[in-house]
């Protein structure tokens, strides 16, 4: 018969022959022959391969180094790598999450638009007219100015993006 030029899914072509790929979690020891099947071996502890493959070496699990602010989100297995995330208050510096940095705080005059997660930083926004923030915080949104009218008071000092309005008593009308 003619030697194949293409192989089925989960097979690979070698020496004009279709051999079975090794399943996830196993590495290739020897290619198949006319008389023998592909020989595969399980990955060692703390190693993995996540696809049907013909790799001769397994990949090492990622180490979520606590000294870099990392912690394990999902433990590695023979078929999957370890997934790292950051300790609370920190977020990954890259998609691969190889290290972490402290969440940014929003300065006075700015409020938190989106709270940071393990993978994204704090998003700040300037406090619009009618709102203020007088603290540096990674959690606080802009607060609305106090409504003096609802307290039967008048504005004594105007608010800014960093300060609340100051309310005071209304001047009594003289007889």
């Amino acid at each position: 018969p003619e030697p194949p030029t293409a192989c089925r899914e989960k097979q690979y072509l070698i020496n004009s022959q279709c051999c079975s790929l090794c399943q996830p979690g196993q590495k290739l020891v020897s290619d198949c022959t006319e008389f023998t099947e592909t020989e595969c071996l399980p990955c060692g502890e703390s190693e993995f391969l996540d696809t049907w493959n013909r790799e001769t070496h397994c990949h090492q699990h990622k180490y979520c180094d606590p000294n870099l602010g990392l912690r394990v989100q999902q433990k590695g297995t023979s078929e999957t790598d370890t997934i790292c995330t950051c300790e609370e208050g920190w977020h990954c510096t890259s998609e691969a999450c190889e290290s972490c940095v402290l969440h940014r705080s929003c300065s006075p005059g700015f409020g938190v638009k989106q709270i940071a997660t393990g993978v994204s930083d704090t998003i700040c926004e300037p406090c619009p007219v009618g709102f203020f923030s007088n603290v540096s915080s990674a959690f606080e949104k802009c607060h609305p100015w106090t409504s003096c009218e609802t307290k039967d008071l008048v504005v004594q000092q105007a608010g800014t993006n960093k300060t609340d309005v100051v309310c005071g008593p209304q001047d009594r009308l003289r007889a």
């Epitope: 060692g44 180490y63 394990v72 433990k75």
Partner: antibody, heavy 119, light 113 residues
Framework: EVQLVKSGGGLVKPGGSLRLSCAAS????????MHWVRQAPGKGLEWVAY????????YYADTVKGRFTISRDNAKNSLYLQMNSLRAEDTALYYC????????????WGQGTLVTVSS | DIVMTQSPDSLAVSLGERVTMSCKSS????????????LTWHQQKPGQPPKLLIY???TRESGVPDRFSGSGSGTDFTLTISSLQAEDVAVYYC?????????FGGGTKVEIK
């Protein structure tokens, strides 16, 4: 036959130190990750620390971080737990357990060694 | 940390009767890469170290009698003993094997009525 034999337990004063050992036999020690798990008298199980087969990866429970150190010597088929700044709440039976590269579970536990922290 | 909650704390059942115990995790134990739930059950008989019973939620460890079965997914898991034998008297612990820190449930103590 798989065996995990402990030594090093005993009575120690608060603030003191102790080193536990776990000697492995009956399997290829260097192929397995290893854990320490403890059990306070009459209580449940609490994971303490893990070390990967090749020494590259180490994780600790927050309760022991900075005080306990897990290590291994594959040439001697031995696992260790160095315990410093011991507290009364560290009093427990300490087990070593192995983790293989297939199940990723603690598939064999040794007999425990008792650590008592008391003045 | 993942909190594992077991119920009941203890139960007394007649020999030959069915035993069911529950384990709930505070977050999913499903590995997104291989679609396995990393929930493990250990059996601890009085005066002995724990022994692996079931891993990946429902796979029995070699040598474990088939009267033991595990089920569940995500955050809700169950261990069943189809017909209780005298040698099954023990405390059964479920364990999060999904992430570090590894965490255990408080245990369910099984006794004979």
């Amino acid at each position: 036959e798989v065996q995990l034999v402990k030594s090093g337990g005993g009575l120690v004063k608060p603030g003191g130190s102790l080193r536990l050992s776990c000697a492995a036999s009956g399997f290829t020690f260097s192929d397995y990750g290893m854990h320490w798990v403890r059990q306070a008298p009459g209580k449940g199980l609490e994971w303490v620390a893990y070390i990967s087969s090749g020494n590259r990866i180490i994780y600790y429970a927050d309760t022991v971080k900075g005080r306990f150190t897990i290590s291994r010597d594959n040439a001697k088929n031995s696992l260790y737990l160095q315990m410093n700044s011991l507290r009364a709440e560290d009093t427990a039976l300490y087990y070593c357990a192995r983790q293989d590269g297939y199940r990723y579970a603690m598939d064999y536990w040794g007999q425990g060694t008792l650590v008592t922290v008391s003045s | 940390d993942i909190v594992m909650t077991q119920s009941p704390d203890s139960l007394a059942v007649s020999l030959g009767e069915r035993v069911t115990m529950s384990c709930k995790s505070s977050q999913s134990l499903l590995n997104s890469g291989n679609q396995k739930n990393y929930l493990t059950w250990h059996q601890q008989k009085p005066g002995q170290p724990p022994k692996l019973l079931i891993y990946w939620t429902s796979t029995r460890e070699s040598g474990v009698p088939d009267r033991f079965s595990g089920s569940g997914s995500g955050t809700d898991f169950t261990l069943t003993i189809s017909s209780l034998q005298a040698e099954d008297v023990a405390v059964y612990y479920c364990q999060n094997d999904y992430t570090y820190p590894l965490t255990f449930g408080g245990g369910t103590k099984v006794e004979i009525k």
